[in-house]
Interface confidence: low
């Protein structure tokens, strides 16, 4: 069988599995001319043989974890045993079987986690070698945890990372693990080889310890501070202690007040800078952040709330100059005049802010002085003594004391004595008829004048009109001004008129004045007006439900998913038919019948959210109206990016040759939201082959640093491989690749002789 | 007991060298930024150079720069100096202090007793 | 660099004393981030300094309640209540807003 078993002498490679006996030859070789015998050299290990007639073979099991390769070379030879072909080089490679059972590096693993850490964040790494090929299932380790001992509830609080043995908090984990209730935790974790897949894979298990300890980056209790405090200030209030030293702390000041009158120092403790004042602000709420020197944070804010405790330190204060009241003549004793309001700004509810009302002089004093009482809490006047006489004493004036428990002050109250009121109201006309009005006639029309007289003291109390609609509006869609010289009313529009709801409305106005009517005296029917609106229909748009329509989903949802859905009426009753309008990435359907609004498309929240759509309601039939209003569509993050690089690392350098172990900075990022900590990646090199050359290590939770582990390296560009895991959920893992090139080097610039200037490096490390 | 010991110090010619050393104990020395700072026979002091925790970044005040190098070894609480192309305006009290690394500004709680450096011909 | 101007450069005073050392920067040492960062430091013969207030008017642990700082800007103080003998020694203003230098110093001696 020439060709696949036999063949002239020339290079060839040659798969072989391992642990399998001989069972065939590997290859006949034939000689041409003058040569008549066979020769092999190079890695046989006593395994290879060739027959001097040219059949190569092996004669027993080979090992891949031995060697994974063997290098041979065959040359031919003549009668005298002189070289007259080749040698040509001839490559076994060893084919990996799962023979080698994946082992823990250790038997008992101790960790440490920290309560309330975050979770995903790994605290700790099982690690196992197997000497099967990586590259294979054989090699490909799956890690799981077997026990969680103690298991509350059957809530797991701990999770590993399947591939690289990472161990790190659950969700309930972060919230629950408490040291104080359970300090230690015992996880039994196992490796299986296979990629955990198979039936047949070998497997080994491992103990780990974890002691649980006590979170003290808490949010300290809400503080009370009173306010204009006369101590030197600062002032410490409170304190947030990070969990290790070195944390640099900062003040987050939510509200963005043009004055923030707190400060933390280097230790954590919080500062009070200036005296406070309630009555311009009575509760501070800010958040107290740790980071790290590379200003990332380090976890969550602290919410730190401050109550502004009152001091009483401010007098009442009058409703105005002169407070003006007035009274009929022959009112009776302890009718009310009137209430005197005065204010204190202090905290409401208390001892600085209860008034008490005095009077202390009465001008002038005819008849008699105290003709007048006031109720020491309320402020409310009464007449006291007698009814008053208006050509005697037209105008009283009272001195009031109005006092809180430190302060006083004086306020002053103007009293008229004017006229009985012994005439009613009278309208000039009892019907003012039929009015008709299109139902989109603007608010604030006035579309009717009425017009009643008072035969009483004019601009008094007594004679001043006011006019009320009493039947027929109860939606409240018109109101009446009254000019206070004429006492002319002006029926207005307040609310937008509705042919659908109202087309005819029988109104009825009562005119009536501010001041009570003398005893025996009553309003009649000749207070009383009536009027016949009559609307017409327009046409309306129909009218949504709300101006901007708002649904939150997290963009992950499957297609055809229903993300939300919109309302509208048409005010004539017609059918609505919704469409969309701007749905620029193709993302939404709206169903034109109900209003609902289903997804068709893959969303991306990293393509930006919320998405803004609008949607449009037409009227079936009729004019076709139509109306607009928003739809906004916010995308909840779903860990959907892997990791990558924050930038263009191409040309990267080492000045060749290396004089010391080199290293350089690189940082990833990626697409997905990361609130208040930022990402936390965890990087590793991305193939077991690079473990020699190179290391990575973690700075924060975006940078690292790659270093040579050695300096012979050759004069040529390395692509460094470099695994980068996002410890989502679930964790995404990008492999990315950094051009590494070593290079002689002239004033620190990479030299490349004329001719070879394409893709010359431009970063020296 | 926080402590600085600072070491190395000496009498040398101009366009010399140097290399001081600072020894801390008391505290986890890998948590703090350190500086070197020195007092002028005129008795004035100058900050000299400044690195940050893992060592990753330096800073030097102008008249130092491309002469003198601060590094840091965490692994044995060491920081140290290394001066060259010494002047004789370098002749100083050289103090080793700790710094409180506050946003980008730099106080000092900690110092050493200092060493002194004199460059003279 | 921003200079750091102290005055008086001396300072005699008598024991129980109320004593005022000045400071005034070149330029604001108001940084962008809200942080003023200026600093007092205290140098006694045959020792090290020893850091009195960070940041204007915080003081540093340990230190009498009798030192305070305050100030803002470009001006800035120093004041000891009632001096004590263990007060005497030289007085020297720092700023880290901008790269970090130093006053000239202000000797308190006795009368």
């Known amino acids: 069988q020439e060709g696949k078993f036999s063949g002239p002498l020339k290079p060839m490679t040659f798969s072989i599995y391992e642990g399998q006996e001989p069972s065939q030859i590997i290859f006949q070789f034939k000689a041409n001319p003058p040569a008549v015998t066979f020769e092999l050299t190079g890695e046989t290990d006593n395994i290879f043989v060739i027959e001097r007639e040219g059949l190569l073979y092996y004669n027993r099991a080979l090992d891949r974890e031995t060697r994974s390769t063997h290098n041979l070379q065959v040359a031919a030879l003549d009668a005298n045993g002189i070289i007259v072909e080749g040698p040509v080089p001839i490559t076994i490679k060893v084919k990996d079987i799962n023979d080698n059972r994946p082992t823990f590096l250790q038997s008992k693993y101790e960790g440490s986690v920290r309560q309330n850490s975050r979770p995903g964040k790994p605290f700790l790494y099982v690690n196992a070698t197997d000497l099967d090929d990586p590259a294979t299932p054989n090699g490909q380790l799956y890690y799981q945890i077997v026990i969680q001992l103690p298991m509350i509830n059957n809530v797991m609080y701990f999770q590993i990372n399947n591939k690289t043995g990472a161990i790190s908090l659950t969700r309930e984990g972060s919230q629950e693990l408490n040291p104080a209730k359970n300090p230690s935790y015992n996880l039994v974790i196992s490796v299986k080889d296979m990629g955990g897949q198979s039936e047949n894979s070998f497997s080994d298990t491992t103990s780990v310890d974890i002691i649980v300890t006590e979170n003290i980056w808490k949010a300290p209790k809400p503080v009370e501070m009173v306010e204009n405090s006369t101590d030197p200030h600062p002032i410490k209030i409170t304190q947030v202690r990070w969990n290790d030293p070195g944390a640099q702390y900062s003040l987050v000041d939510k509200e963005k007040l043009p004055r923030f009158p707190f400060s933390i120092d280097q230790e954590g403790d919080i500062y009070v800078t200036q005296p406070l004042d309630r009555e311009e602000k009575d509760a501070y709420v800010f958040y107290a952040v740790a980071k790290d020197e590379y200003g990332k944070p380090l976890s969550y804010p602290l919410e730190i709330h401050v109550k502004v405790k009152d001091i009483n330190d401010n007098p009442p204060t009058c409703p105005s100059p002169v407070t003006v009241f007035e009274v009929q003549e022959n009112e009776r004793l302890g009718n009310s005049i009137g209430t005197l309001t005065a204010h204190d700004r202090d905290e409401e509810n208390t001892a600085n802010s209860f008034l008490n009302y005095r009077i202390v002089e009465q001008t002038p004093k005819l008849p008699m002085d105290g003709l007048f009482l006031i109720q020491t809490y309320a402020g409310m006047l009464q007449l006291a003594k007698q009814s008053l006489k208006k050509q005697d004493t037209p105008q009283y004036n009272l001195t009031i004391e109005v006092s809180d428990k430190d302060f006083k002050t004086l306020c002053f109250v103007q009293i008229n004595v004017i006229d009985i009121n012994d005439q009613i109201p009278i309208f000039e006309k009892s019907d003012y008829g039929n009015l008709t009005l299109a139902e989109d006639t603007n608010i604030g029309s006035t579309i009717l004048t009425i017009q009643a007289t008072d035969a009483d003291e004019p601009f008094t109390g007594s004679s001043k009109i006011l006019y009320h609609i009493i039947k027929g509006d109860s939606e409240g869609r018109l109101g009446v001004d009254t000019d206070p010289h004429t006492n002319t009313g002006y029926v207005i529009i307040k609310k937008p008129l509705d042919f659908e709801t109202a087309a005819v409305s029988n109104i009825v106005f009562k005119a009536e004045n501010p001041e009570p009517l003398v005893f025996g005296v009553k309003y009649n029917a000749s207070s009383f007006a009536k009027f016949t609106l009559i609307v017409t229909d327009v046409n309306e748009a129909p009218q949504f439900s709300q101006h901007v329509f708002q649904a939150k989903v997290s963009e992950d949802v499957a297609i055809g998913t229903k993300v939300g859905n919109v309302t509208a009426k048409d005010p004539e009753g017609l059918d609505i038919s919704y469409s969309l309008r701007g749905d620029t990435r193709g993302w939404l359907k709206i169903d034109h019948v109900t209003g609902e609004i289903f997804s068709v498309a893959p969303l991306d929240r990293e393509a930006g959210s919320p998405y803004r759509v609008q949607v449009v309601a037409t009227e079936v039939g009729g004019s076709s109206l139509s109306s607009v209003s928003e739809f906004h569509l916010i995308l909840m993050d779903v860990n959907d990016n892997p990791p990558r690089l924050a930038k263009d690392y191409t040309g990267l350098f080492f000045c060749h040759p290396l004089s010391a172990p080199g290293s350089l900075i690189f940082e990833a990022t990626d697409d997905d939201q990361h609130l208040f900590r930022g990402p936390h990646f965890t990087f590793s090199l991305g193939s077991g082959s690079l473990q020699n050359d190179w290391e990575v290590s973690k700075i924060n939770g975006t940078h690292a640093r790659l270093s040579t582990r050695h300096t012979e390296f050759e004069e040529r560009e390395y692509v460094v491989l470099i695994r980068i895991n996002d410890g989502g959920r679930p964790p995404l893992e990008g492999i990315v690749s950094l051009p590494v090139t070593f290079c002689s080097c002239v004033e620190g610039s990479c030299f490349r002789p004329a001719g070879h200037q394409t893709g010359i490096p431009t970063v020296g490390m | 007991e926080v402590q600085l010991l600072e070491t190395g110090g000496g009498v040398v010619k101009p366009g010399g060298s140097l290399k001081l050393s600072c020894a801390a104990s008391g505290f986890t020395f890998s948590n703090y930024g350190m500086s070197w700072v020195r007092q002028t026979p005129e008795k004035r002091l100058e900050w000299v150079a400044a690195?940050?925790?893992?060592?990753?970044?330096?800073y030097y005040t102008d008249n130092v720069k491309g002469r003198f190098t601060i590094s840091r070894d965490n692994a044995k609480n060491s920081l140290y100096l290394q001066m060259s192309s010494l002047r004789s305006e370098d002749t100083a009290l050289y103090y080793c202090?700790?710094?409180?690394?506050?946003?980008?500004?730099?106080?000092?709680?900690?110092w050493g007793a200092g060493t002194t450096v004199t460059v003279s011909s | 660099d921003v200079v750091l101007t102290q005055t008086p450069l001396s300072l005699p005073v008598t024991l129980g004393d109320q004593a005022s050392i000045s400071c005034r920067s070149s330029q604001s040492l108001l940084h962008s981030n809200g942080n003023t960062y200026l600093h007092w430091y205290l140098l006694k013969p045959g020792q090290s300094p020893k850091l009195l207030i960070y940041?204007?008017?915080n003081r540093f642990s340990g230190v009498p309640d009798r030192f305070s700082g305050s100030g803002s800007g470009t001006d800035f103080t120093l004041k000891i209540t009632r001096v004590e003998a263990e007060d005497l020694g030289v007085y020297f203003c720092s700023q880290s807003t901008h790269v970090l230098t130093f006053g000239a110093g202000t000797k308190l001696e006795l009368k």
């Open positions: 690195i940050n925790r893992d060592g990753g970044t330096t």
């Open positions: 202090a700790r710094q409180f690394l506050l946003w980008d500004g730099w106080y000092f709680d900690v």
């Open positions: 940041k204007v008017s």
